[in-house]
């Protein structure tokens, strides 16, 4: 049999070998595609199938506009002028070239030694799905799951059957001061089809700087709250990427999931104490904020107790 690839929406003509070019002809076309469940024999007189597969006067089969459902096998059996039976067999595959891929949400710069999202490469409207590949300075990037991480997603349009591919690249640059160029390419994996490339993006890699300081903000200001009230502690850090934040009360770590915000709802006297946050940065180790005192007291009590945070409601570590 012969393998045929046809572009979706384009016409395709399959010739019936051995068939006389003009009637009278003895021939039979049958097909097994996404439109059939088994073999469908086409009527030489034509009929409702003519909109998708029509037998031409010369015996060839015309598919006026190939679609995904037309993928499959087409066979013709003809008797030539000498009375010999000749068979033709075609395996038809269809394809659609998507629009030019794009890198969406590209990073503005990268930080050395830490994971950075470079961007997401998007290709829309392909068939079959195809693949997206990332390139660094013109060379293919092979994801290793550590320094180079690629997260892929493939979606199929419910009506058209065409694919949308997304590929998110995360890298850990080894050193600062460089200007790597990233690009992405889409390939259908068909012979004689060149990949489609995105416009390249060039990014600066900077060395990670130390965090500029940690501010512990408390709400309500002063850290004094009535029983049953809510206290919100926020650990504000300027570092990039944002470090993990853990919490300490009266010198002991609190068994909570890392979060830059600590919420104390419906406080009681057991919540009183000295709180601080600890930011753990991959390249700089832990940094602790100045402590904040929380007092639970009925309204009307005197102002802030000794050692509590001042009027501004925040402590700063330079």
């Amino acid at each position: 049999g012969q393998n045929i690839t046809a572009r979706i929406g384009e016409p395709l003509v399959l010739s019936c070998k051995g068939a006389p070019k003009k009637p009278p002809q003895q021939l039979e076309w049958k097909l097994n595609t996404g439109r059939t469940e088994a073999w469908k024999v086409l009527s030489p007189q034509g009929g409702p199938w003519d909109s998708v597969a029509r037998i031409l006067p010369n015996g060839s089969l015309l598919l006026p506009a190939t679609g995904i459902v037309d993928e499959g096998t087409f066979r013709c059996r003809a008797t030539n002028r000498r009375g010999k039976e000749v068979k033709s067999n075609y395996r038809v595959r269809v394809y659609q070239i998507p629009g030019k891929p794009e890198i969406v949400d590209p990073a503005s710069e990268l930080t050395a030694s830490v994971p950075n999202k470079v961007g997401t490469c998007v290709s829309e409207g392909s068939y079959p799905a195809g693949t997206l590949s990332w390139h660094l300075d013109g060379k293919l990037l092979i994801p290793d799951g550590k320094e180079t991480l690629v997260k892929e997603e493939t979606r199929r349009h419910p009506e058209t059957g065409l694919f949308t591919l997304r590929s998110e690249l995360t890298v850990i640059p080894t050193q600062g001061g460089t200007h790597p160029t990233f690009s992405c390419s889409f390939s259908l994996g068909l012979p004689r089809r060149r990949p489609l490339n995105t416009a390249p993006i060039q990014l600066r890699v900077r060395e990670p700087g130390p965090p500029e300081g940690i501010q512990l903000l408390v709400e309500p200001e002063g850290g004094i709250v009535a029983p049953g009230g809510t206290v919100t502690l926020t650990c504000a850090i300027s570092a990039q990427p944002p470090p993990q934040v853990h919490w300490i009360k009266d010198g002991a770590p609190l068994p909570l999931a890392p979060s830059p915000v600590l919420l104390l709802p419906e406080v009681g006297h057991e919540d009183e104490g000295t709180y601080s946050c600890v930011a753990t940065h991959p390249s700089h180790g832990p940094q602790e904020s100045p402590p904040v005192s929380i007092r639970v007291t009925e309204t009307g009590d005197e102002g802030p107790a000794e050692g509590s945070v001042g009027e501004s409601g925040l402590g700063t570590l330079a």
Epitope: R35, T36, E37, G46, G47, P48, W49, D50, S51, V52
Partner: antibody, heavy 119, light 107 residues
């Protein structure tokens, strides 16, 4: 909204001729095959003629072949049925329908126009 | 030519009943069958396309199924507005062939 409006029906003598028209709107007319279906009084539905979207290919059952001609004018979004050598058994309501090929079947129907063949 | 043998030709049923109408094709027509509803003096309205798919705007109590060359239209809970005549159509081969119709009447 898809709309199909037939016209041209009426009383005609046996052996006479009549031309039915169907005005289509609400869809891209030249993307679809079109079909005429008829229904004799108190009877079932019968296929009369189909035409492909370009108008190049037409299809008929034996009962009307060589007497009826289906045609279309894609510029005017119009479908036609020219009926010659009319017989009493052609008396029916004639419906203009969208489709007729395997991709569509028959999905939308006009309200019909009555053709009476009688002396 | 393909014959579409529709049964029953008529039936009496009450509101809330389950109603089943069958069309048998004389040869394989694949999935290429439509079902229509027709009320007196009105044009047919498509209910089911390609044997099993519900057409837009058709209540979900209507459903179509297929077993080889047998096609079934089911109304899961008959409503007063469902009393009408129902037709099947094969559109796999010419001549396009309709079933003879099933008239659903009030018991």
């Amino acid at each position: 909204e898809v709309q199909l409006v037939e016209s041209g029906g009426g009383l005609v003598q046996p052996g006479g001729s009549l031309r039915l028209s169907c005005a289509a709107s609400g869809f891209t007319f030249n993307n679809y095959w079109m079909t005429w279906v008829r229904q004799a009084p108190g009877k079932g539905l019968e296929w009369v003629a189909s035409i492909d979207n370009s108008g190049d290919n037409t299809y008929y059952p034996d009962s009307v072949k060589d007497r009826f001609t289906i045609s279309r004018d894609n510029a005017k979004n119009s479908l036609y049925l020219k009926m010659n050598s009319l017989r009493a058994e052609d008396t029916a309501v004639y419906y203009c329908t969208r489709g007729g090929d395997i991709t569509t079947g028959l999905d939308y129907w006009g309200q019909g126009t009555l053709v009476t063949v009688s002396s | 030519d393909i014959q579409m043998t529709q049964s029953p030709s008529s039936l009496s049923a009450s509101v809330g009943d389950i109603v089943t109408i069958t069309c048998r094709a004389s040869q394989d027509v694949g999935i290429y069958v439509n079902w229509f509803q027709q009320k007196p003096g009105k044009a047919p309205r498509r209910l089911i396309y390609r044997a099993t798919n519900l057409a837009d705007g058709v209540p979900s109590r209507f459903s179509g199924s297929r077993s080889s060359t047998d096609f079934t239209l089911t109304i899961s809970s008959l409503q007063p507005e469902d009393f009408a005549t129902y037709y099947c159509l094969e559109f796999d081969e010419h001549p396009l062939t309709f079933g003879g119709g099933t008239k659903v009447e009030i018991k």
